[in-house]
Interface confidence: low
């Protein structure tokens, strides 16, 4: 009968050996130390150490709860020369035998002949002296060349803890000891870990232990049984350093992009080639500006950056599809745009046919001004009246009547939606110095400076449909609101997180897409729309935005 009894006691002794060795050293000068821990369910493990050990003595631990009708004893077995240990089995392994209010009187009793002598005694508060069982069921969930995901389970842990547990893990690398292994701490009840930066095709061992957050004298559980695993071997020439490939691709891509930008900016031959590639049906300026063509030898950039007064720009013979181009000096343009709120609105147009289209022809006209951004789009306003030749009697606002161009007038009523000047926010694009400095980002969606904006069809197609109406929080500084678009170079100021303060009321100042959205139309609050650099908006596209404005 002795052998079977010993077989189940041995694992308990192995469990208690670390306890015994750590506390045996504390017993000096004939003093004894009696230390017990509760596993939170149905086990109290005790170690008694006595300097000047009693030879051939039978000792036991007796537990007597203050509010339970049971008591329990266990026989102390030697684990070292001066230490004994035993486990008080209080019931079924997962039964909750004690609570946070229990106090258990624990005694060490040693037999002296026919008598029993009390060697040690303590009033034991179970939930102040916790030591859980070692985690079990360690298993490799997923292993790769450089990482391994491992999971485990906790055993016989009280439901009282809920999630108030923490874990420590360690990995044994080849050529090292467990003591040298760095500790990985998980400050929450997380029964898995992903080990990173492992070496391919290498044997590792892994251990984990657990500790409740509760209890003044609570300590870590024993380490789990080590889990051995091997990382996958690296494929030849591949995955030796996983990030190296990504880095090379990224760097080469960046260099390629920089070279491409450089070529586009500096190569004079790029223009015609780019036009062919993009298949853009851009009109030849020399047909429309004969005087400039003769003066500057066909160099468009030279014309437009020329420091001549605006009187030198006189349009020549006009093609039927494009009105005269009005080029104003920089400061005049911005002043005109800012003052447009003060201009009294003219009477509504009588013509149903006449349209004034405004859009940015960024791909064509570039100003290089000394006090502006490095590359700036020249905002060019065209007026177009397909019916003016057929029906000259009908008044057409904004269309030229003679050879000299007329200043553009802001339109009123419904036509505001089609032809107006840019909003004050967008004036910054070609006159940053005109407006005040940056202001704090608006935090209220839909408030001042955050009108409801509607995109043209060409842009709507590129916006994901999950942008449907939803309340938006404050814009994140440094992040463009419309992340789906690649901003043109002149948008760098806005992309850096600056917003332009409103210079005044926004009545009559809007983009063609600034009408309130109708049924099924896209709507986004606080959206900031970059100018469309990818394609020109044709007249048909502009007209197609609102069926009420079809010519």
């Amino acid at each position: 009968m002795a052998a079977p009894a010993l077989s189940w006691r041995l694992p308990l002794l192995i469990l208690l050996l670390p306890l015994a060795t750590s506390w045996a050293s504390a017993a000096v000068n004939g003093t004894s130390q009696f230390t017990c821990f509760y596993n939170s369910r149905a086990n109290i493990s005790c170690v008694w150490s006595q300097d000047g050990a009693l030879q051939d003595t039978s000792c036991q631990v007796h537990a007597w709860p203050d509010r339970r009708r049971w008591n329990q004893t266990c026989e102390l077995l030697p684990v070292s020369q001066a230490s004994w240990a035993c486990n008080l089995i209080l019931g079924a392994p997962d039964s909750q035998k004690l609570t946070t209010v229990d106090i258990v009187t624990l005694r060490v009793l040693c037999r002296e002949g026919v008598r029993w002598r009390v060697m040690a005694i303590q009033d034991f508060k179970p939930f102040e002296n916790l030591r859980l069982m070692a985690p079990i069921s360690l298993q490799v969930v997923h292993v790769e060349t450089h990482r391994c995901n491992i999971s485990w389970e906790i055993s016989q842990a009280s439901h009282y803890f809920e999630r108030h547990l923490e874990f420590e893990a360690r990995t044994l690398s080849p050529g090292h000891t467990w003591e040298e292994a760095p500790l990985l701490t998980l400050k929450q009840k997380q029964e898995w870990i992903c080990l990173e930066t492992l070496t391919p095709d290498t044997q590792y061992e892994f251990q984990v232990r657990v500790k409740p957050l509760q209890g003044e004298f609570t300590t870590w559980s024993p380490w789990s049984q080590p889990l051995a695993f091997r990382t996958k071997p690296a494929a030849l020439g591949k995955d030796t350093i996983p990030w190296l490939g990504h880095l090379l691709v990224g760097l080469s891509g960046a260099f390629g992009f920089i070279i491409l930008v450089y070529l586009l900016i500096n190569c004079r031959n790029t223009g015609p080639w780019l036009k062919k590639v993009l298949k853009c049906n851009t009109p030849d300026p020399s047909k429309f500006f004969s005087q400039l063509s003769s003066e500057h030898g066909g160099d468009v950039q030279k014309w437009l950056s020329s420091p001549f007064p605006s009187s030198s720009f006189s349009p020549g013979g006009l093609a039927p599809e494009i009105s005269p181009l009005e080029v104003l000096e920089r400061d005049k343009v911005t002043q005109l745009l800012l003052q447009q709120d003060k201009v009294p609105e003219p009477a509504s147009l009588s013509s149903n046919h006449s349209l004034t289209s405004c859009f940015t022809n960024q791909g064509y006209f570039f100003f290089h001004l000394p006090d502006a951004l490095e590359i700036e789009a020249c905002q060019v306003y065209f007026t177009y009246d397909p019916y003016s030749e057929e029906d000259p009697d009908e008044g057409v606002a904004g269309a030229p009547t003679g050879s000299s161009p007329q200043p553009l007038q802001p339109l009123s009523g419904e036509d505001d939606a089609y032809c107006t000047f840019p909003s004050r926010d967008d004036l910054l694009l070609f006159s940053p110095s005109l407006l005040g400095g940056p202001s704090p980002p608006s935090t209220a969606p839909g408030g001042s400076g955050a009108g409801e904006e509607r995109m043209p069809p060409s842009l709507q197609e590129r916006v994901p449909r999950d942008w449907d109406p939803q309340p938006l929080g404050p814009p994140t500084p440094g992040v463009p609101d419309l992340v789906d678009f690649q901003p043109p170079p002149e948008l760098v100021l806005r992309e850096a997180g600056e917003e332009v303060p409103d210079a005044g009321p926004r009545e009559g100042v809007s983009f063609p897409w600034s009408r309130p959205p109708g049924q099924g139309e896209f709507r986004a609050l606080n959206a900031r729309l970059p100018l469309n650099t990818d394609a020109y908006l044709s007249l048909q596209e502009l007209q197609g935005q609102d069926p009420t404005h079809l010519v």
């Epitope: 007796h62 537990a63 007597w64 008591n71 009793l109 008598r115 029993w116 009390v118």
Partner: nanobody, 128 residues
Amino acid sequence: QVQLQESGGGSVQAGGSLRLSCTASGFTFDDEDMGWYRQAPGNECELVSSIGSLGRRYYADSVKDRFAISQDNAKNTVYLQMNSLKPEDTAVYYCAATKGGSWLDSILASCQGAFGYWGQGTQVTVSS
């Protein structure tokens, strides 16, 4: 000098009742757990019942629902009320005290050999 003095033992018919008393001197019950052990001829010493300083009570399975332990701190006396006595309850009953402690059931081989303070015992005989 600590002394425990038992009284109330005697002979009784099966089904009868007895009340044992244990009066202590030289210490107060506030610091002690008091209990009753018994030892029949040829048997080990057995803890019958105990009452702790925290008011906790313990009864051996063989006497549950028949015996009741109580104490009077003013008189420094502990009582064991024994009802529905059976012939197997025949034994010498010992009063014992131990400081703040637990009462041992299965590991005691001999009464008066464990710990704390012991009385001289009182004989209880139950006849059928």
